[in-house]
Amino acid sequence: VSITKCNSDMNGYCLHGQCIYLVDMSQNYCRCEVGYTGVRCEHFYL
């Protein structure tokens, strides 16, 4: 799988995580910080 950084327009796409561009899927993926979940790392869990 080819991975690169997200385009600048997607700054802020991931609320609590790192934005990764999955080239082969032509979409972003959020790698969430510990304690966060959701497509955009928008949910906090204990």
Epitope: N7, S8, D9, N28, V39
Partner: antibody, heavy 116, light 106 residues
Framework: QDQLVQSGAEVKKPGASVKVSCKAS????????IQWVRQAPGQGLEWMGR????????KYREKFEGRVTITADTSTNTAYMELSSLRSEDTAVYYC?????????WGQGTLVTVSS | DIQMTQSPSSLSASVGDRVTITCKAS??????IAWYQQKPGQAPRLLIQ???TLQPGVPSRFSGSGSGTDYTFTISSLQPEDIATYYC????????FGGGTKVEIK
């Protein structure tokens, strides 16, 4: 399956406003950005702007700034594009498009005709 | 706004010909360019993204290359079903389409 269903064709007088809706099903608009693109008859594609429905953050093309308003209602999974002070050159098909980086899913388009 | 200058605006070629379309960005777009095909009455279809990544189901005669501000889209052997208008799209910073290239059969 995933769908974007837009409102029907509109005929407007110059100076009026139009509001086009775009209802999503099969996915949550909060997971994406919703972009708006238009195409005048026989002309090219023109990006107008986009909304991040989760953050309610909008970005517009400079030429439309102050004339276009993009909104989203996450409770109904619907996005809207309102264009004011219409002129004849705004006659076009208006598309809403789901994106997570790319334009990966298009609505069927809404024809807006501006005519006196 | 980033400007995308696409050329030519139209071209006529024979079946089997190699067809090349170029797009020049007003600033570095870091390979974030896509190419779309649009046929009359249809929504655009994504062919290539991130400069050179072919979408599933797209024939291998379509290809893309480039970096920085200069990008190229190529049809290696034009087929009758390729008659359409092609657009580049930069998606590094917001979105901008090129003006389009109408491809016709000679």
């Amino acid at each position: 399956q995933d769908q974007l269903v837009q409102s029907g064709a509109e005929v407007k007088k110059p100076g009026a406003s139009v509001k086009v809706s775009c209802k999503a099903s099969g996915f949550n608009i909060k997971d994406t950005y919703i972009q708006w693109v238009r195409q005048a008859p026989g002309q090219g594609l023109e990006w107008m702007g986009r909304i991040d429905p989760l953050r309610r953050n909008t970005k517009y093309r400079e030429k439309f700034e102050g004339r276009v308003t993009i909104t989203a209602d996450t409770s109904t999974n619907t996005a809207y594009m309102e264009l004011s002070s219409l002129r004849s050159e705004d006659t076009a098909v208006y598309y809403c498009v789901r994106s997570r980086t790319l334009f990966d899913f298009w609505g069927q388009g809404t024809l807006v005709t501006v005519s006196s | 706004d980033i400007q995308m200058t696409q050329s030519p605006s139209s071209l006529s070629a024979s079946v089997g010909d190699r067809v090349t379309i170029t797009c020049k960005a007003s600033q570095d777009i870091h390979k974030y360019i896509a190419w779309y095909q649009q046929k009359p009455g249809q929504a655009p279809r994504l062919l290539i993204q991130y400069t050179s990544t072919l979408q599933p189901g797209v024939p291998s005669r379509f290809s893309g290359s480039g970096s920085g501000t200069d990008y190229t889209f190529t049809i290696s052997s034009l087929q009758p079903e390729d008659i359409a208008t092609y657009y580049c799209l930069q998606y590094d910073n917001l979105r901008t389409f090129g003006g389009g290239t109408k491809v016709e059969i000679k």
